[in-house]
Interface confidence: low
Amino acid sequence: AGVFELQIHSFGPGPGPGAPRSPCSARLPCRLFFRVCLKPGLSEEAAESPCALGAALSARGPVYTEQPGAPAPDLPLPDGLLQVPFRDAWPGTFSFIIETWREELGDQIGGPAWSLLARVAGRRRLAAGGPWARDIQRAGAWELRFSYRARCEPPAVGTACTRLCRPRSAPSRCGPGLRPCAPLEDECEAPLVCRAGCSPEHGFCEQPGECRCLEGWTGPLCTVPVSTSSCLSPRGPSSATTGCLVPGPGPCDGNPCANGGSCSETPRSFECTCPRGFYGLRCEVSGVTCADGPCFNGGLCVGGADPDSAYICHCPPGFQGSNCEKRVDRCSLQPCRNGGLCLDLGHALRCRCRAGFAGPRCEHDLDDCAGRACANGGTCVEGGGAHRCSCALGFGGRDCRERADPCAARPCAHGGRCYAHFSGLVCACAPGYMGARCEF
């Protein structure tokens, strides 16, 4: 048993252009809090799968209100550590997700509103009892700086917190089967759970009798540094202090194996032993499974029935593609009738209807003339989604309310003179012309 501890140092805009606006404003003051989720192994599971190693929620930070015009600073943080107790062995390799949440303190109905500002994730190797490890992670334009460590809770000790050290009942030597627990000489250690001789600094175990190595160490007891072979290497100059040959550059130097693969030298070159889920010469190829959370947009991931189809994504409505990564252009099906404008809002389709039409798909043709009166004897004509008045002679305008001057448009051709008349207009034609509009 033990505790994983996380100390958040800062959360604020990252370097470079596109710095985010402050998440809080004078109108909406807010405060931050953090959630950490731990999972065993080097899986990159979806954030919503169980935090099998444990999870913790920080206290709320101080209330922050943006100062208008000022650049977004690092935001005030909650006090204290985030502590995730673990009851079983510390696995040595783990995945973490750290979420930064904003609590808005405005006048929301039903209390404060929460929203996720940033989520960072990573995969790490970490021995319990070691020093604080520092990290910087970026999520979009935000930057999170933090440190973490795993420590064992007494009586557990060791890199996996699997060795039990019991306080001595008396200052005499430890009882049968027990030996002093270095460096705590006033405690006694229970019989080892790991394989006898497994390096307490570089090895750990999750099952009795095994010895698993931390990164950089190899051998059955994790006592051999990776890429060196002690004094057996013929390369390099002799060391005055040990009399051993100091290894020169070898094919495994710098560990060419990616994704946690371990490197071993071969007569010609090197060979990578890849962790589960990776393959290729340098373990650079990922065999994606559902554990990697490959289905986007809420897609449902189902493990495939055979190795060639490691997973299948069942996409929710509105998404398609092997990873549900493509939004279906539902407007391409032209669901809006009568010239309505289609809007795909993601969670739903909306049709913006032209005047005179209504309904979810603009399928209802409204009676354009309903309740519309045309004045001065005009008659209403439906069409095109809007009403139109056909006005009686001498009247015009949208509702036939305007008195029309029939001569205003100069309807009489070839210099004919126009006279307004109760029944319309009369043209007095110039000599040599005739017709109602003097057109002949």
Partner: antibody, heavy 119, light 107 residues
Framework: EVQLVESGGGLVQPGGSLRLSCAAS????????MHWVRQAPGKGLEWVAY????????SYADSVKGRFTISADTSKNTAYLQMNSLRAEDTAVYYC????????????WGQGTLVTVSS | DIQMTQSPSSLSASVGDRVTITCRAS??????VAWYQQKPGKAPKLLIY???SLYSGVPSRFSGSRSGTDFTLTISSLQPEDFATYYC?????????FGQGTKVEIK
């Protein structure tokens, strides 16, 4: 077609042991969470344990911790629940279910096997 | 452990009714909430995952929503085959926990 078939249930005395099996077909259990969920007569659902065989990782409900052990044999595509020190309150129908990853709902369930602990 | 408090514990409704069942989590559980339907003598069936996503093959009259730590299952128009017991379940934090169930009976 995905299928889960439980077996191994039966009548056992308090303090006794039983081993339940969950044989899976139509998918590979090594890349799935495998759960055991139980339901006492006339009661609601209670999650018991899960295993993620790829990493051998297990998790248990407090009520069974130290008494029950979940395991898997990926070569047989089968998950197991070893139940020791059984008590009367462990009497229930035990279901095996497959858990999804992205959402962690349990999308496929077995038909259940009844475990009765009684003297 | 996270408690999932489900209400009501039972309700009577008629065919065609709109039915709403709620679940409140004792702390934030992200959207990792699922809803199940169970009929007597049968295994539960997944209806909703990730709080609001409809599982494939489930009729569209079922829907799920989330507001903070409150989760809701809605049946828009109850059908004869919908009379059953419904459970919510959270999977954001270990241990996984279920609500105590809501029995939907015929009025």
């Amino acid at each position: 077609e995905v299928q889960l078939v439980e077996s191994g249930g039966g009548l056992v005395q308090p303090g006794g042991s039983l081993r339940l099996s969950c044989a899976a077909s139509g998918f590979n259990i090594s890349s799935s969470y495998m759960h055991w969920v139980r339901q006492a007569p006339g009661k609601g659902l209670e999650w018991v344990a899960y295993i993620y065989p790829s990493y051998g990782y297990t998790s248990y409900a407090d009520s069974v911790k130290g008494r029950f052990t979940i395991s898997a044999d990926t070569s047989k595509n089968t998950a197991y629940l070893q139940m020791n020190s059984l008590r009367a309150e462990d009497t229930a129908v035990y279901y095996c279910a497959r858990g999804g990853y992205y959402y962690h709902g349990m999308d496929y369930w077995g038909q259940g096997t009844l475990v009765t602990v009684s003297s | 452990d996270i408690q999932m408090t489900q209400s009501p514990s039972s309700l009577s409704a008629s065919v065609g009714d709109r039915v709403t069942i709620t679940c409140r989590a004792s702390q934030s559980v992200s959207s990792a909430v699922a809803w199940y339907q169970q009929k007597p003598g049968k295994a539960p069936k997944l209806l909703i995952y990730s709080a609001s996503s409809l599982y494939s093959g489930v009729p569209s009259r079922f829907s799920g929503s989330r507001s903070g730590t409150d989760f809701t299952l809605t049946i828009s128009s109850l059908q004869p085959e919908d009379f059953a017991t419904y459970y919510c379940q959270q999977a954001s934090w270990s241990p996984i926990t279920f609500g105590q169930g809501t029995k939907v009976e015929i009025k």
